[in-house]
């Protein structure tokens, strides 16, 4: 008889050598072993080279083997599951080369203090990663970039003080995230991106509730049914959501989701959402506004959808956190060429501070489509994903200009033609916006005369009416340049042109801004009905260190053509300006506010 017991499971030979007082691999292991249990032995060190001849090996259990080192010097081409839990490993070697088929990796209950950046390189099939109960204090950026199929990630019971902002980027299959029992103080803005995570565990951290927590707070509010309290031995599916388990360490353990954020800028730059909770949901769309002076490139990736399930709004939101790259001296407006389209570079060299406003709306249902202009060739129906880039310079004083890039992609086999120049077409009066990018650029007064009214023009000489209202708000008692909020609204069912107005308002100091319309009080209104009206900079200069002048959107960047509508129909949009100060917690360069 063998030292180890032998059975078979789902066509795999299972060899159980657990707790046999082994100090090395047994000599009589069957050559066709598919599942090997070596747990609870005193192996000390282990090398994958010792198993290279076991070509059927699919599951390997090395838990509780007093391992202090692991060598991946032999390739186990079929290994899918590796259990290294409850050992004394202080570091992990690179695993991808030796274990290319790995789908589950359990290194929980070890002594890992850190992970090398490329430790998971090559693990493209990984679906479950268990790193709980280690001594991890930080995670390298890009750790999970190679593991795009990841479904379960357990980082609980470590010493993590912060998380890389892009940790979850690209993990579209992720469904369970364990982050409980760490030393986390906040969640980076945009951390969750557009992921819909059914099961998230976040309790027992050092959540510090201040204005930087607003993004996280809003995420908790939006995902309250997906946040759970972990209990030993209880299947998450048998428990009920408990968003109140996520508590502010600095505020008497008050739940983070109910943190009022008093004194924080409304629609703070640290939220990816708006704060207008009382506005009725319009599950068809998400609108993202970015208003920034940070001299970094902001790239937002979008996907155009023809349809989406009518679940929560979050599950329909399509956007990813920005990526930042260094910029060059020149800023260039670039339209990446696609078949039938032209490339239109326009170079600007200038020094003044540009405040860039980007309004991006993503279409969810299919009635409204993107179409090219008549002068452009229509792509084949099964167009490949194409890049449409609208670049906007936002230099600071004596710093390099910065482009702002928007990438639009379409799924393969899509029947929606996507022109390089985004044309907004609404087949019938509709309140559903189409994916588009409206770009407003402001700069200091220059010698070149600049119109004071913002217009969105069509390729032909024609007048397009502008969205109706711009409301600028700022909290009272501010002694520093405060992020200012503006709201663009369009009255519903209106069929007549509406003049554009700019309204400066200040919220009551004690009011939590949950519905801008009902809580702000008008202080000053300047109606911009003609170019001769009071220039907008006279209103804004009270709040900005540099004056602002509205520029028309470049014709080549975005053209909006309403059909059968007498005015441009846009959803309500909140936007916030930001000072260039690096010290303010509210001035993340890529805050964005989502509104229904």
């Amino acid at each position: 008889q063998h030292t180890c017991s032998i059975s078979k499971v789902t066509s795999l030979l299972e060899v159980n050598c657990e707790n046999k007082k082994l100090t090395a691999l047994p000599a009589d292991l069957p050559a066709d072993t598919g599942i090997l249990h070596l747990g609870e032995n005193q192996l000390g060190t282990f090398s994958t080279a010792s198993l290279v001849h076991f070509t059927h090996l699919t599951y390997l259990y090395l838990d509780r083997c007093e391992l202090t080192s692991l060598q991946t010097n032999g390739k186990l081409i079929k290994l899918e599951n590796l259990d290294l839990s409850h050992n004394n490993l202080k570091s992990l070697p690179s695993l991808g080369w030796a274990l290319p088929a790995l789908t589950t990796l359990d290194v929980s209950f070890n002594k890992l203090g850190s992970l090398s950046p490329g430790v998971l390189d090559g693990l493209s099939q990984l679906q479950e990663l268990y790193l709980q109960n280690n001594d991890l204090k930080s995670l390298p950026p890009g750790l999970l970039l190679p593991t795009t199929k990841l479904k379960k990630l357990n980082l609980a019971n470590n010493k993590l003080r912060e998380l890389p902002s892009g940790l979850l980027d690209g993990l579209e299959d992720l469904d369970t995230l364990y982050l409980q029992r760490n030393w986390l103080r906040t969640i980076p803005k945009g951390f969750f991106g557009t992921l819909l995570l059914p099961f998230v565990f976040l309790h027992a951290n050092s959540w510090y509730c201040d204005c930087e927590i607003l993004y996280f707070r809003h995420w908790l509010q939006e995902n309250a049914n997906n946040v759970y309290l972990w209990k030993q031995g209880v299947d998450v599916k048998d428990t009920t959501p408990n968003v109140a388990s996520v508590r502010c360490a600095n505020l008497d353990n008050a739940p983070v989701y109910s943190y009022p954020g008093k004194g924080c800028p409304t629609s703070s730059g640290d939220t990816d959402y708006d704060d207008y909770d009382d506005i009725p949901d319009v599950p068809a769309t998400r609108t993202e506004v970015k208003f920034s002076t940070n001299t970094k490139v902001h790239t937002t990736h979008w996907s155009l959808l023809a349809a989406a399930p009518s679940t929560s709004q979050d599950s329909q939101m399509i956007s990813l956190p920005p990526t930042h790259k260094p910029t060059k001296k020149q800023s260039t407006f670039i339209h990446t060429q696609s078949p039938g389209f032209t490339t239109l570079p326009e170079t600007m060299e200038s020094n003044p501070t540009f405040y860039s406003l980007k309004l991006n709306t993503v279409l969810i249902p299919s009635p409204t489509t993107l179409e090219p202009t008549s002068t452009q060739a229509t792509p084949e129906p099964n167009i490949q994903p194409m890049l449409t880039t609208s670049t906007l310079t936002t230099p600071e004083h004596s710093t390099t200009p910065v482009p702002t890039t928007t990438i639009l992609t379409t799924p393969e086999h899509s029947t929606i033609p996507v022109p390089t120049t985004a044309i907004l077409t609404t087949p019938k009066p509709s309140t559903i916006p189409v994916p588009t990018t409206a770009t407003l650029t402001t700069l200091e007064p220059s010698t070149t005369p600049v119109p004071t009214t913002a217009t969105l023009t069509t390729p032909e000489p024609s007048t397009t009416l502008v969205p109706t209202t711009a409301t600028l708000t700022t909290p009272e008692h501010s002694t520093t340049p405060v992020p200012t909020t503006a709201t663009l609204t369009t009255p519903e069912h209106s069929t007549t042109p509406v003049p554009t107005t700019a309204t400066l308002t200040t919220p009551e100091p004690s009011t939590t801004l949950t519905n801008l319309v009902s809580t702000i009080s008008p202080v000053l209104t300047t109606t911009l009905t003609t170019p001769e009206s009071t220039p907008i900079e006279t209103i804004l200069e009270q709040f900005f260190t540099t004056e602002l002048t509205l520029l028309p959107t470049l014709e080549s960047t975005t053209t909006i053509i309403p059909e059968q509508n007498s005015f441009l129909n846009l959803p309500e949009v909140a936007l916030v300006s930001s000072d260039t100060s690096e010290s303010s917690p509210f001035l993340n360069s890529d805050f964005c506010c989502f509104l229904p």
Partner: antibody, heavy 118, light 113 residues
């Protein structure tokens, strides 16, 4: 045509031993897992043991330590050595071929009767 | 061990009529890795050895008439004979080939009324 022919059955006293053989033909014997399945008189089917193509044996608890399965690929023959036989081991013993690495049985022999009685 | 339970234990049938046999396992036979259910069906005709009818729940063995079909997932499985013929009489067994020890149902005896 696949053929499996069992032999070696008979009457044996409790505690005794018996060796069954299964001669295989019509397929590449060495490439397939083989098994023994038994059927007590008037009863259902019960798996007794298997051996992989690589020669790894495995058993249910009911016969573990008493029965030993083996194969001789050069002779295309499967064996079952039965020791410490009990009355409850009385059954028709079938030799069965598995399909690849799977563990269902696509061909069966005609069976050989083993009777354990005093 | 996985326990297999068949019902009914006896099934009188009329030729040309359909027949159905149920098999339940004490634990799931679904392999999440490949989404296959590891269940097989055998027919043991009177005085003969068992013969394989179906494996992986629904895959018919070559040479088996298409009036035999298998279905089910997880723990509940069914063998159906669309139109019973006289030659279909015998004892039908289900077997799980998910994990050893391989276990069989008690058998369902199909006989002509």
């Amino acid at each position: 045509e696949v053929q499996l022919v069992e032999s070696g059955g008979g009457l044996v006293q409790p505690g005794g031993s018996l060796r069954l053989s299964c001669a295989a033909s019509g397929f590449t014997f060495s490439s397939f897992a083989m098994s023994w399945v038994r059927q007590a008189p008037g009863k259902g089917l019960e798996w007794v043991s298997s051996i992989t193509s690589a020669g790894t044996p495995y058993y249910p608890d009911s016969v573990l330590g008493r029965f030993t399965i083996s194969r001789d690929n050069s002779k295309n023959t499967l064996y079952l050595q039965m020791n410490s036989l009990r009355a409850e081991d009385t059954a028709v013993y079938y030799c069965a071929k598995s399909r690849g690495y799977e563990d269902y049985f696509d061909y069966w022999g005609q069976g050989t009767l083993v009777t354990v009685s005093s | 061990d996985i326990v297999m339970t068949q019902s009914p234990l006896s099934l009188p049938v009329t030729p040309g009529e359909p027949a159905s046999i149920s098999c339940k396992s004490s634990q799931s036979l679904l392999n999440s890795r490949n989404q296959k259910n590891y269940l097989a069906w055998y027919l043991q005709k009177p005085g003969q050895s068992p013969q394989l009818l179906i494996y992986f729940t629904s895959t018919r063995e070559s040479g088996v008439p298409d009036r035999f079909s298998g279905s089910g997932s997880g723990t509940d499985f069914t063998l159906k004979i669309s139109r019973v013929e006289a030659e279909d009489v015998g004892v039908y067994y289900c077997q799980q080939h998910y994990s050893s020890p391989w276990t069989f149902g008690q058998g369902t005896k199909v006989e002509i009324k």
